[in-house]
Interface confidence: low
């Protein structure tokens, strides 16, 4: 057990100019900070819980933003941010620090929170070491801070896993610390299981071997990773040169939420990170008092240790801790191939040519509200529209008077006559058909069936404009 401590030294514009907040504060403001600790150095899913713990600072002094630029250094809350940890300190961890501004204006739902800066660092840190200083940039802001992890007696060591007890009561007088963190002042640590890794294992009871974060196996020799060794079975793999243990109760690490697995006779035991408990660390014990909700999320529930908390996330954020920014464009709100732009405070759609509206839902080229003149009918297709015009009219909107004979449709010298139902071809001698396209053979036999009674070669042939077949 121990405590992670974070001291914020300053927060203000970094070298090169005053940052402009995306929000405009209309009244007095104050700063506060949130810290989130996650185990391991790997890039965790953004919405993964702050399994090592989280803490919220007090509010800082009230200040009023200048209309032109923020103060060079904004007033900070007093005191350390402290995140207690119950189990072993993992040594490798992710540190997330958020700087928040609370607007004290008159908004529905309480003071408005806006995130000014967020820094995420992956760090190695031994417990009991000195303060580690850091300067981080977040956009145009600069954050200066120090941090350390310290064990709480009787735990000592770089992982706070060795228990330090006085060898005899006479060694420690009244009012003195139980013992100094020196090996010879402490009770000898328990003898672990033979072969238990000195680097990755520890024990609190004789004969056991419990693994630090990221290690598994009966002797804590096997890294929890996606290495080529995993998935193989048998005593070893000659192809990879990896030592692969046989099947064991900790294979595949049954402990959820960053818990580490230790084998026990015929079973396993999970050492759960702070905030989780249960046989497999599957039950969350984090409460709202731990400040688990990020990005202005509202924590509801968790009033007692057995009830799970729920983070109500503000628009634009999701995940169990409101840590994941919603890609609102993934919902594809822009129609008709529009380009989606998430501006944070709003979504915008950049529409393709021919489309308009907040979501590009209006097709400027469609038939809606587009009348085709002179009895024409509108036909949609391919994001555009066209008018199928009534006889005698043409053009985009059927507003132009068309001459059906203009295209000289009658073949072989036939004469064209415009007609209310189409056009009529008067064929030259020796030709017949709707467009005079068929020659009459010299022997008097047509290439087509005989003309109906009363229709002789050379008579005008009626040809409705919209048909493509001849009529006899």
């Amino acid at each position: 057990a121990g405590v992670f401590e974070l001291q914020i030294h300053s927060f203000g514009p970094g070298p090169g100019g005053a940052p402009r907040s995306p929000y405009s504060a209309r009244g007095p403001c104050r700063l506060f900070f949130r810290v989130c600790l996650k185990p391991g150095l790997s890039e965790e899913a953004a919405e993964s819980p702050c399994a090592l713990g989280a803490a919220l600072s007090a509010r800082g002094p009230v200040y009023t933003e200048q209309p032109e630029a923020p103060a060079p250094d904004l007033p900070l809350p007093n005191g350390l941010l402290q995140v207690p940890f119950r189990d072993a300190w993992p040594g490798t961890f992710s540190l997330i620090i958020e700087t928040w501004r609370e607007e004290l204006g008159d908004q529905i739902g309480g003071p408005a929170w806006s995130l000014l800066a967020r820094v995420t660092r992956r760090r190695r840190l031994a417990a009991g070491g000195p303060w580690a200083g850091d300067i981080q940039r977040a956009g145009a802001w600069e954050l200066r801070f120090s941090y350390r992890a310290r064990c709480e007696l009787p735990a000592v060591g770089t992982a706070c896993t060795r228990l330090c007890r006085p060898r005899s009561a006479s060694r420690c007088g009244p009012g003195l610390r139980p013992c100094a963190p020196l090996e010879d002042e402490c009770e000898a640590p328990p003898v672990c299981r033979a072969g238990c890794s000195l680097e990755h294992g520890f024990c609190e009871q004789p004969g056991e071997c419990r693994c630090l974060e990221g290690w598994t196996g009966p002797l804590c020799m096997v890294p929890v990773s996606t290495s080529s060794c995993l998935g193989l079975r048998g005593p070893s793999s000659t192809t990879t040169g990896c030592l692969v243990p046989g099947p064991g109760p900790c294979d595949g690490n049954p402990c959820a939420n960053g818990g580490s697995c230790s084998e026990t006779p015929g079973s396993f035991e999970c050492t759960c990170p702070r905030g989780f408990y249960g046989l497999r660390c599957e039950v969350s014990g984090v409460t709202c008092a731990d400040g688990p909700c990020f990005n202005g999320g509202l924590c509801v529930g968790g009033a007692d240790p057995d009830s799970a908390y729920i983070c109500h996330c503000p628009p634009g954020f999701q995940g169990s801790n409101c840590e994941k920014r919603v890609d609102r464009c993934s919902l594809q709100p822009c129609r008709n191939g529009g380009l989606c732009l998430d501006l944070g405070h709003a979504l915008r759609c950049r529409c393709r040519a021919g489309f308009a509206g907040p979501r590009c839902e209006h097709d400027l080229n469609d038939c809606a509200g587009r009348a085709c003149a002179n009895g024409g009918t509108c036909v949609e297709g391919g994001g555009a529209h066209r008018c199928s015009c009534a006889l005698g009219f043409g053009g985009r909107d059927c507003r132009e008077r068309a001459d059906p004979c203009a295209a000289r449709p009658c073949a072989h010298g036939g004469r064209c006559y415009a007609h209310f139902s189409g056009l009529v071809c008067a064929c030259a001698p020796g030709y017949m058909g709707a467009r005079c396209e068929f020659p009459v053979h010299p022997d008097g036999v047509s290439a087509l069936p005989a003309a109906p009674p009363g229709l002789r070669p050379g008579d005008p042939q009626r040809y409705p404009h919209h048909h493509h077949h001849h009529h006899h």
Partner: antibody, heavy 118, light 108 residues
Framework: QVQLQESGPGLVKPSETLSLTCTVS????????WTWIRQPPGKGLEWIGY???????NSNPSLKSRVTVSLDTSKSQFSLNLSSVTAADTAVYYC????????????WGQGTMVTVSS | EIVLTQSPGTLSLSPGERATLSCRAS???????LAWYQQKPGQAPRLLIY???SRATGIPDRFSGSGSGTDFTLTISRLEPEDFAAYYC?????????FGGGTKVEIK
Amino acid sequence: QVQLQESGPGLVKPSETLSLTCTVSGDSISNYYWTWIRQPPGKGLEWIGYIYYSGTTNSNPSLKSRVTVSLDTSKSQFSLNLSSVTAADTAVYYCARVFNRGFAFDIWGQGTMVTVSS
Amino acid sequence: EIVLTQSPGTLSLSPGERATLSCRASQRISNTYLAWYQQKPGQAPRLLIYGASSRATGIPDRFSGSGSGTDFTLTISRLEPEDFAAYYCQQYDTSPLTFGGGTKVEIK
């Protein structure tokens, strides 16, 4: 001006499922949480459940096994399904908007009366 | 769940008088996550106060809220004829979100 309008049958038979829809106009349904609240005749208000467009939902444990809240962003609507209804579910059902910095309900529909009776 | 108890159940007053409505929580409400609503017969509730003491948009300044922890108060400094209605408190600190049983302010 944001407006909410509840719709659905006013009479439901016992053991059947009550289905109501709330249509949101005047703002994007993606910008807020949305909730259902009910009020039995002559009695107080009871929170039923809420939904956010990302899929986040929560409902009152006293009703949880019977409640489904869903949302359709394309129609700008969210819905309530309450299964296995009894006469005790007779109430005026309200849909409301949840302001995004605190779970107070700042805009309400006018309410729709649902009677459970055979 | 947090149980909210409102008192009195009915308050009989005359226009111009001061009304004091109480809402007591069964457990501490952190961050003053408490709201007050007004409801007139046949109408939906209307948000008056959020965060225990902040007036919602368009609410006259004769309405004020106060309190923290487990005891909260809604005060109407000078009753107008349109203020005679039912009033409900609601906590949004702990799930499930709960309402009080209501106080009816009626004309004496």
